[in-house]
Amino acid sequence: EQAPGTSPCSSGSSWSADLDKCMDCASCPARPHSDFCLGCAAAPPAHFRLLWP
C-alpha cells in the first residue's frame, strides 16, 4: 500500500489507491472521477512541462 505523501510514479502519472499502481494522467480529462486524477492536478503531465522549460 502506498505511504501518504510519497509517490513512486513517473512524471505524467499518479498513484491509484483503487488499483495499487500508477495510472496515466492522460486519461483524466475523459474520466475525471478516477481516484488518481487528484494527484494529476498537482503536477502537470510531462508533455506540458516541455512547453515551459
Epitope: 500500500e1 483503487d18 488499483l19 495499487d20 475523459a30 478516477s34 481516484d35 488518481f36
Partner: antibody, heavy 120, light 108 residues
C-alpha cells in the same frame, strides 16, 4: 480456467448477519480488484462493493454503506462480504466478479452466485 | 448517480434476425460502456467493453457502438443461444457504477 465460487448465502432474519465468501482459482488473485454485485429476484443488476488488489481501498453503494464490509485474503485467494443489519430489500443473488486491470472498467469473470434471503 | 436507460425492455425475434438494443446515459460517459449477457439462473457474461471492443471468445455477430450518451448493441444474426437478457453498464462515474434495467430477447 478462471473460476469464482461464492458460498455463505442462506435464510436470515431481518437485522441478522451473514458472511459471504468467494474462492478464486485459475488466475493470480492478488493483482485484481474485486467486486460484489447483486440481483434481487426478477430484477436487474446492482453494484454493491469494490475492493482494491491490496485491500487498502474499498467502496460501497449507498444502499449498503455502514452495514456491509468487503475484505479479501490474498494468501487464501478469497474475497469476503460481511453483511450486517440485513433488511428484506437485501434479498438477492450475490455475485463476486473480477474487475479489469485498468480502472473500474468492466467485470470480466463472475461467480455463479449465492442466494441471500432476508425474511422473518 | 448516472442513470442508464435501455430500450426496449423486451423484444421478440426469430433466429437469423438482426437485433439492436439501445442504452442511453443520463449524461456523457465517453466510451465507458460495457454490455453483458445473462441467461436464466446463470451469471452475467461480458460481451463488449469500452463501447465497441469484443471480449475474447465472444462471437463476432455481437458488436457495440456509440459514445457520449447513446450506445447500441447489435446481434447481426440471432442464434438460438442468444435468447437472454442483456445489460449495459457505465464505468465513467466511479465508484458509483450503474447498470441498465435490462433487455430481454425472447423467441418470436
Amino acid at each position: 480456467e478462471v473460476q469464482l465460487l461464492e458460498s455463505g448465502g442462506g435464510l436470515v432474519q431481518p437485522g441478522g448477519s451473514l458472511r459471504l465468501s468467494c474462492a478464486a482459482s485459475g488466475f493470480t488473485f492478488s493483482p485484481y480488484p474485486m467486486m460484489w454485485v447483486r440481483q434481487a429476484p426478477g430484477k436487474g443488476l446492482e453494484w454493491v462493493s469494490y475492493i482494491s488488489p491490496s485491500g487498502g481501498s474499498t467502496h460501497y453503494a449507498d444502499s449498503v454503506k455502514g452495514r456491509f464490509t468487503i475484505s479479501r485474503d490474498n494468501s487464501k485467494n478469497t474475497l469476503y462480504l460481511q453483511m450486517n443489519s440485513l433488511r428484506a430489500e437485501d434479498t438477492a443473488v450475490y455475485y463476486c466478479a473480477r474487475g479489469g486491470d485498468t480502472y473500474f472498467d468492466y467485470f470480466d469473470y463472475w461467480g455463479q452466485g449465492t442466494l441471500v434471503t432476508v425474511s422473518s | 448517480d448516472i442513470q442508464m436507460t435501455q430500450s426496449p425492455s423486451s423484444l421478440s425475434a426469430s433466429v437469423g434476425d438482426r437485433v439492436t438494443i439501445t442504452c442511453r446515459a443520463s449524461q456523457s460517459i465517453s466510451s465507458y460502456l460495457n454490455w453483458y449477457q445473462q441467461k436464466p439462473g446463470k451469471a452475467p457474461k461480458l460481451l463488449i467493453y469500452a463501447a465497441s471492443s469484443l471480449q475474447s471468445g465472444v462471437p463476432s455477430r455481437f458488436s457495440g457502438s456509440g459514445s457520449g450518451t447513446d450506445f447500441t448493441l447489435t446481434i447481426s444474426s440471432l442464434q438460438p443461444e442468444d435468447f437472454a437478457t442483456y445489460y449495459c453498464q457505465q464505468s465513467y462515474s466511479t465508484p458509483g457504477i450503474t447498470f441498465g434495467q435490462g433487455t430481454k430477447v425472447e423467441i418470436k
